[in-house]
């Protein structure tokens, strides 16, 4: 089947959510692990990731259409320590499939704001760290 992975971000007050979304068929879920890495250009794996999610087949979903599964990593308050390069990945050892999303970056600025760049859905997100608004 056709499986792909996308990255996105959302802001809720001072919190920043980094979201990895895997699009797949229902029957393809089992055996996949989705994971988010930081500053791991060559060895992004579940063991080295910030967070991982093992997908389960949801018996409550009917049909064989494409569905999505999401891993969400929440940063409660962005600090300079969160600056870096991030990547959403997924793999199934059973099927022999590995997906690697585009790299995106968080840059904490001197003014106390931060920007998220490199996301495909929203090419450039800039957040105000203090006020918690999208600018």
């Amino acid at each position: 089947g056709c499986i792909n992975i996308t990255s996105s971000a959302s802001q809720e007050g001072t919190r920043l959510n980094l979201i990895c979304t895997v699009w797949h068929k229902k029957e393809e879920a089992e055996g996949f692990v989705v994971f988010l890495c930081k500053d791991r250009s060559g060895d992004c794996s579940p063991e080295t990731s910030l967070k991982q999610l093992r997908l389960k087949r949801d018996p409550g979903i009917d049909g064989v259409g494409e569905i999505s599964s999401q891993l969400m990593f929440t940063i409660s308050q962005v600090t300079p320590l969160h600056s870096g390069t991030y990547q959403c990945c997924a793999r199934s050892q059973k099927s022999g499939i590995r997906l690697q999303g585009h790299f995106f970056s968080i840059l904490f600025t001197e003014t106390g704001n931060y920007t998220v760049t490199g996301l495909k859905q929203r090419q450039h997100l800039e957040f105000s760290h203090n006020e918690g608004t999208l600018s």
């Epitope: 793999r91 199934s92 590995r98």
Partner: antibody, heavy 112, light 107 residues
Framework: QVNLQESGPGLVRPSETLSLTCTVS????????VNWFRQPPGKGLEWMGT???????DYNSALKSRLSISRDTSKSQVFLKMNSLQTEDTAIYFC??????WGQGVMVTVSS | DIQMTQSPASLSASLGETVSIECLTS??????SAWYQQKSGKSPQLLIY???RLQDGVPSRFSGSGSGTRYSLKISGMQPEDEADYFC?????????FGSGTKLEIK
């Protein structure tokens, strides 16, 4: 129908390099990765390494210094090269698409 | 490396009998376990993945269970064609590792 077929020399001299080919059909190497496993006669299985659908590789750390896995997607072939062979490398070598589909294996004997 | 301690090493069972094989792992593998059947002179066949999921085409008399560091394979009603070697495997961490195998024979 998914099919994998290993091929290579049945006999290799100690200290020489082993070259094996896994020819696949029924799927694309751009969509699915291939593992190499081996099994000494009468023994258990050992994972050697993986070449993923995106071309990236992962190796067993115990073999990494002398193992290389590559592919030719246009020919639907995956290659294993392992140097400095010793008698303890005598085994049946299998390629597999993920864990689901395995070749029948090729017996490799390391002997002088 | 994660060690996979498989038991028993060999097992004899009568036709129709229910048999179980166990694998203990040296650390929690979060259900990233699989079971294979290997008949004499053949390549391994995947039976169970993700600890308990039955691979397509595998008879329902095979089942897998477990979590953490303890996993098991159960055959409910031994059949003649089940005479084979069985291996557990973990795919939680590299290198992927296998148990030493269980030889299942008909009594």
């Amino acid at each position: 129908q998914v099919n994998l077929q290993e091929s290579g020399p049945g006999l290799v001299r100690p200290s020489e390099t082993l070259s094996l080919t896994c020819t696949v059909s029924g799927f694309s190497l751009i969509s699915y990765g291939v593992n190499w496993f081996r099994q000494p006669p009468g023994k258990g299985l050992e994972w050697m390494g993986t070449i993923w659908n995106d071309g990236g590789t992962d190796y067993n750390s115990a073999l990494k210094s002398r193992l290389s896995i590559s592919r030719d997607t246009s020919k639907s072939q995956v290659f294993l090269k392992m140097n400095s062979l010793q008698t303890e490398d005598t085994a049946i070598y299998f390629c597999a698409r993920g864990f689901e589909h395995w070749g029948q294996g090729v017996m490799v004997t390391v002997s002088s | 490396d994660i060690q996979m301690t498989q038991s028993p090493a060999s097992l004899s069972a009568s036709l129709g009998e229910t048999v179980s094989i166990e694998c203990l792992t040296s650390e929690d593998i979060s259900n990233d376990s699989a079971w294979y059947q290997q008949k004499s002179g053949k390549s391994p066949q995947l039976l169970i993945y993700a600890a308990s999921r039955l691979q397509d085409g595998v008879p329902s008399r095979f089942s897998g269970s477990g979590s953490g560091t303890r996993y098991s394979l159960k055959i409910s009603g031994m059949q003649p064609e089940d005479e084979a070697d069985y291996f557990c495997q973990q795919s939680y961490k590299y290198p992927l590792t296998f148990g030493s195998g269980t030889k299942l024979e008909i009594k």
